[in-house]
């Protein structure tokens, strides 16, 4: 058993049918010695008396808010949560496996630049009695500070028969060094509590590996005289790191016909313009990627040819 | 070239070669099935490789003030990786394919390090840790780790030379 926060404790259980569970001793936080009784949750049934209460915690019915009283007055509370270990592996009931980029990916994170700011998100089908707490650091043995905000519900979508809820959090490395080569990964730890179930999820990454630039901005077409060709131009997204002579992007320009089956023409360039042939009813799209490190491409910025 | 006395390197040449290094490093080790190398044990890891750190002056301001600190750091790293790529980690079993980019990568690391330091002038170089994995699978894992680490290193070096070519060339 360990303390999650003041008066909230996590009991770790080896979870299998007929498991013996864990013996837990609760102590009433009071100078009083006599006339103390214990109850669980809203029940008025007295579970025991005395300054300490010894219980055998086996299942969720044994978890909850234990309260010690004296003469009708509440003295203190202890909330017991359960953390299930199933055959040596901590349970992952609360969050959905996003399966991208690999199985057992519960947390996904992205950064728009090298400033040390990043966003993480996760999915669940649970709509109520759910709380999250997020901590982060650079490295784990001698951790350097990363400050995370509160996790918020960022999207809801219907998937088949049930609803899916997306939560996200923004974090910022306290002393980021955008130009340095990272040697210690960022660690992100999410505590999830659903009713009386506790779970924790972690992710470890380098900012360089989660970079995904915003799409190029101000995408424009300039027809070239007496030609089917057009000059496409664009600019670096505002959110990308500066100076651009140091934090350079490379670009992919694509001409795509109306039908998805039509052949796509693609051009790669380090410049912020390119000359392409504009077909009728086609659209021109441009996306960006770090020039020197193959992290994710941005989403496409698009304009119609006409 | 970064000659004794601290004159400027051939920024544009360095830029071209460092960008080529980035391409080679990624073709030598693309993201193989998203193998998470940080999860793959640290018993024979590449933690001892030289990293371009915050105080090494490789940021735009540091380069403007005095690029020599940064160039020395990059040179150290180039020599370090050049030696690693020439070691039995890469020459031993399992043999690299004949058309593997590792050979080109090795030669380009040497080429860029020579651009930065002509003969007769010596910056101190970092000692290579004695990494001699016994099993072929350990060697394979170490190759992946070294190449992933090299990708990060040459990305920073390429940024330095791109910025230098754009802003510090005479």
């Amino acid at each position: 058993i360990w303390e999650l926060k003041k008066d909230v404790y996590v009991v770790e259980l080896d979870w299998y049918p007929d498991a013996p569970g864990e013996m837990v001793v609760l102590t009433c936080d009071t100078p009083e010695e006599d006339g103390i009784t214990w109850t669980l949750d809203q029940s008025s049934e007295v579970l025991g008396s005395g300054k300490t209460l010894t219980i055998q915690v086996k299942e969720f019915g044994d978890a909850g808010q234990y309260t010690c009283h004296k003469g009708g007055e509440v003295l203190s509370h202890s909330l017991l949560l359960l953390h299930k270990k199933e055959d040596g592996i901590w349970s992952t009931d609360i969050l959905k496996d996003q399966k991208e980029p690999k199985n057992k990916t519960f947390l996904r994170c992205e950064a728009k630049n090298y400033s040390g700011r990043f966003t993480c998100w996760w999915l669940t089908t649970i709509s109520t009695d759910l709380t999250f707490s997020v901590k982060s650091s650079r490295g784990s043995s001698d951790p350097q500070g990363v400050t995370c905000g509160a996790a918020t519900l960022s999207a809801e979508r219907v998937r088949g028969d049930n609803k899916e809820y997306e939560y996200s959090v923004e974090c910022q490395e306290d002393s980021a060094c955008p130009a340095a080569e990272e040697s210690l990964p960022i660690e992100v730890m999410v505590d999830a509590v659903h009713k009386l179930k506790y779970e924790n999820y972690t992710s470890s990454f380098f900012i360089r590996d989660i970079i995904k630039p915003d799409p190029p901005k101000n995408l424009q077409l300039k027809p070239l005289k007496n030609s089917r060709q057009v000059e496409v131009s664009w600019e670096y997204p505002d959110t990308w790191s500066t100076p651009h002579s140091y934090f350079s992007l490379t670009f992919c320009v694509q001409v795509q016909g109306k039908s998805k089956r039509e052949k796509k023409d693609r051009v790669f360039t380090d410049k912020t313009s390119a000359t392409v042939i504009c077909r009728k009813n086609a659209s021109i799209s441009v996306r960006a990627q770090d020039r020197y490190y193959s992290s994710s491409w941005s989403e496409w910025a698009s304009v119609p040819c006409s | 070239r970064a000659v004794p006395g601290g004159s400027s390197p051939a920024w544009t040449q360095c830029q071209q070669l460092s960008q080529k290094l980035c391409t080679l490093a990624w073709s030598a080790h693309p993201l193989v099935g998203h193998m998470d190398l940080r999860e793959e044990g640290d018993e024979e890891t590449t933690n001892d490789v030289p990293h371009i750190q915050c105080g090494d002056g490789c940021d735009p301001q540091g380069l403007r003030d005095n690029s020599q600190f940064c160039l020395q750091r990059i040179h150290q790293g180039l020599i370090f990786y050049e030696k690693l790529l020439g070691s039995d980690i890469f020459t031993g079993e399992p043999s690299l394919l004949p058309d593997s980019p590792v050979g080109q990568l090795h030669a380009s690391l040497l080429g860029l390090s020579q651009l930065l330091q002509p003969e007769g002038h010596h910056w101190e170089t970092q000692q290579i840790p004695s990494l001699s994995p016994s099993q072929p699978w350990q060697r394979l894992l170490l190759r992946f780790k070294i190449l992933r680490s090299l990708q990060a290193f040459v990305a920073v070096a390429a940024r330095v030379f791109a910025h230098g070519a754009a802003t510090l060339s005479p």
Epitope: Y16, P17, D18, E59, K85, E86, D87 | E39
Partner: antibody, heavy 115, light 112 residues
Framework: QVQLVESGGGVVQPGRSLRLSCAAS????????MHWVRQAPGKGLEWVAF????????YYADSVKGRFTISRDNSKNTLYLQMNSLRAEDTAVYYC????????WGQGTMVTVSS | QSVLTQPPSVSGAPGQRVTISCSGS????????VKWYQQLPGTAPKLLIY???QRPSGVPDRFSGSKSGTSASLAITGLQAEDEADYYC????????????FGTGTKVTVLG
């Protein structure tokens, strides 16, 4: 004491269907994940499928994906395996078992796929 | 196709010590715990070892398990006639859990 009893096995022709049941008693069935494991005659153990305690997630071996469906009815304390498009290579003893460090197995039910 | 490899058979005289190996990789045994089962002819598997080296109550202390790196082993000391059975190791893969990975199985024969 935990008890698992499989039923529903038998002889079936290739391409046909069969539904296996596993009746659980002696524990809070709705709190635990459950597996189906099979063993072809004279062969080793092969995992078939898993279902979470609440039925929210199901996992299958590649060899049965798209043909077999695992389900559970927690109100009846029963686990099911719906087997469609049966093949000769599905011939085996099918066991249900609880998920956890200390597991409990049923006695098994024999499924024979033969023309 | 099992990814946990065991020897097809091992044998020993009564009273002897035999060991069964179970070889996996970093993503399965290297990252997860190992169980061992005993299966007597015509019966369901019986748990012998869990969490690499723990014995459930009722299992004789002649059976012991260990794990090192990407391999695990089961040792039977003071071999007895009733130990003649098939033995299976089981683990999980880091990326496919909760799918069970079983070893190929080992037939233990008690000689004489």
């Amino acid at each position: 004491q935990v008890q698992l009893v499989e039923s529903g096995g038998g002889v079936v022709q290739p391409g046909r269907s069969l539904r296996l049941s596993c009746a659980a008693s002696g524990f809070t069935f709705s709190s635990y994940g459950m597996h189906w494991v099979r063993q072809a005659p004279g062969k080793g153990l092969e995992w078939v499928a898993f279902i979470r305690y609440d039925g929210s997630n199901k996992y299958y071996a590649d060899s049965v994906k798209g043909r077999f469906t695992i389900s559970r009815d927690n109100s009846k304390n029963t686990l099911y395996l719906q087997m469609n498009s049966l093949r000769a290579e599905d011939t085996a003893v099918y066991y249900c078992k609880t998920h956890g460090s200390h597991d409990n197995w049923g006695q098994g039910t024999m499924v024979t796929v033969s023309s | 196709q099992s990814v946990l490899t065991q020897p097809p058979s091992v044998s020993g005289a009564p009273g002897q010590r035999v060991t069964i190996s179970c070889s996996g990789s970093r993503s399965n045994i290297g990252s997860n715990t190992v169980k061992w089962y005993q299966q007597l002819p015509g019966t369901a598997p019986k748990l012998l070892i869990y969490y690499n080296d723990q014995r459930p109550s009722g299992v004789p202390d002649r059976f012991s398990g260990s794990k090192s790196g990407t391999s695990a082993s089961l040792a039977i000391t003071g071999l007895q006639a009733e130990d003649e059975a098939d033995y299976y190791c089981q683990s999980y893969d880091r990326y496919t859990h909760p799918a069970l990975l079983f070893g190929t199985g080992t037939k233990v024969t008690v000689l004489g």
